[in-house]
Interface confidence: low
């Protein structure tokens, strides 16, 4: 049974793209009425508890640390809040993905990342980031350095033996400026990624302001 409580919030304290054997902190935004916060991972449509925190009012929002990240720990996470013993509320889901070589080595090759029309653009222009690989890829992910929000994910297109995805940033704003990387993934485990592409720096500069 769900009470009339606000939708809780879940976030990764750092990037949700985590290197193999790395760690990440997940924060479950507190609900005043909740006495217990549980972090769950959703695997094969079933919930598995990762941790739980008894909530005391003077404490900060409950945090959970996921250590030694691997393919088993990658996936969709949710915070579950107990309000009365029989009442609970779920947050949105947070996707955690892990980068690194999988045992079969099918993700060994890094993709390449390029930008059109130019890595230096003015606000309001249309920019496309192109992620490519010569190896079988089902989806590409694009992440921005320092961003805690989920990476963009696109299904790959097969173009003359190249697998690619075009990420459109249109129209660009100053918020789009930063360092981007892209990753390959296979449908067998969409939360397991290749090593990243070389970083690509996108500069969004307002030339009229500079002049």
């Amino acid at each position: 049974q769900e009470g009339d409580f606000p939708m809780p919030f879940i976030s990764a304290k750092s990037s949700p793209v985590i290197p193999l054997d790395g760690s990440v902190k997940i924060q479950c935004q507190a609900i005043r009425e909740a006495y217990l916060t549980q972090l769950m991972i959703i695997k094969n449509s079933t919930y598995r508890e990762i941790g739980r925190r008894l909530k005391f009012w003077n404490e900060t929002d409950p945090e959970f640390v996921i250590d030694h990240m691997d393919a088993n720990k990658a996936g969709r996470y949710q915070c579950q809040y107990r309000i009365g013993h029989y009442r609970f509320r779920y947050s949105d889901t947070l996707e955690l993905v892990v980068t690194g070589e999988e045992p079969a080595g099918r993700l060994r090759d890094r993709p390449s990342l390029s930008v059109r029309p130019s890595p230096s653009v003015a606000p309001g222009e249309n920019v496309t980031l192109l992620c490519q690989s010569g190896n079988r890829t089902d989806t590409f992910l694009l992440s921005k350095e320092g961003a805690a929000h989920r990476p963009l994910r696109l299904r790959s297109q097969d173009q003359d033996g190249w697998y690619q995805a075009e990420f459109s940033l249109s129209p660009v704003t100053s918020a789009h400026g930063g360092t981007y990387r892209c990753y390959r993934s296979l449908s067998t485990n969409p939360y397991l990624l290749s090593q990243p592409s070389e970083p690509l720096a996108l500069l969004v500069a307002d030339y009229t302001m500079q002049n």
């Epitope: 006495y35 217990l36 549980q38 769950m40 919930y47 598995r48 008894l54 009365g84 013993h85 029989y86």
Partner: antibody, heavy 122, light 112 residues
Framework: QIQLVQSGPELKKPGETVKISCKAS????????MNWVKQAPGKGLKWMAW????????THTDDFKGRFVFSLETSASTAYLQINNLKNEDTATYFC???????????????WGQGTTLTVSS | DVVMTQTPLTLSVTIGQPASMSCKSS???????????LNWLLQRPGQSPKSLIY???KQDSGVPDRFTGSGSGTDFTLKISRVEAEDLGVYYC?????????FGGGTKLEIK
């Protein structure tokens, strides 16, 4: 060790009020829920309410609304069951039981008080 | 409410012999947190209930090894490998997964 000690037997007349206490010891009172369970003579167990000892919020069944008041004195690690306007059918043994809340499987274990026998008779 | 059905109503067993009783729930007791809140109690004559098993199969402290709980979903079993005189009383199963918490009607264990 964990103990729940309840107040002694009560003999009351219909229309009167009774307040039964349950004093907990051996654990952090706020970290575990408290339940009240009724057992009429020769009958089975019937769950009445669960109290979130952290917030003081009771969750009870429709059968135990109105005349039944579930409260806490957290500083004394004590839970109370008060029944107003007593009726003959309230004659029963009332148990408090620690269960629920908590951060480990320990919260799923149940510990029971010795019971308080209430007799309502004119 | 979730209905808990215990069978048999009465169990007559000779000291030293095994005993088995069943508890069935009208809905699955697997909670959203992955746990199954199904416990077993023993109420000896004139005494308060005493916890035997919690979370389907976990023995409470001080409970003899001859008591074992098993089951999942809606079907649960309590077994006593060798009945002793102190085991007589009424055994209750109860669930805490769904609101409200409900008890089975009990199985009375008698000594032959």
């Amino acid at each position: 060790q964990i103990q729940l000690v309840q107040s002694g037997p009560e003999l009351k007349k219909p229309g009167e009020t009774v307040k039964i206490s349950c004093k907990a010891s051996g654990y952090t009172f706020k970290n575990y829920g408290m339940n009240w369970v009724k057992q009429a003579p020769g009958k089975g167990l019937k769950w009445m309410a669960w109290i979130n000892t952290y917030t003081g919020e009771p969750t009870h069944t429709d059968d135990f609304k109105g005349r039944f008041v579930f409260s806490l004195e957290t500083s004394a690690s004590t839970a109370y069951l008060q029944i107003n306007n007593l009726k003959n059918e309230d004659t029963a043994t009332y148990f408090c039981a620690r269960w629920g809340l908590g951060t480990t499987e320990e919260a799923a274990r149940d510990y029971w008080g010795q019971g308080t026998t209430l007799t309502v008779s004119s | 409410d979730v209905v808990m059905t215990q069978t048999p109503l009465t169990l007559s067993v000779t000291i030293g012999q095994p005993a088995s009783m069943s508890c069935k729930s009208s809905q699955s007791l697997l909670d959203s947190d992955g746990k199954t809140y199904l416990n077993w109690l023993l109420q000896r004559p004139g005494q308060s209930p005493k916890s035997l098993i919690y979370l389907v199969s976990k023995q409470d402290s001080g409970v003899p090894d001859r008591f074992t709980g098993s089951g999942s979903g809606t079907d649960f079993t309590l077994k006593i490998s060798r009945v002793e005189a102190e085991d007589l009383g009424v055994y209750y199963c109860w669930q805490g997964t769904h609101f409200p918490q409900t008890f089975g009607g009990g199985t009375k264990l008698e000594i032959k």
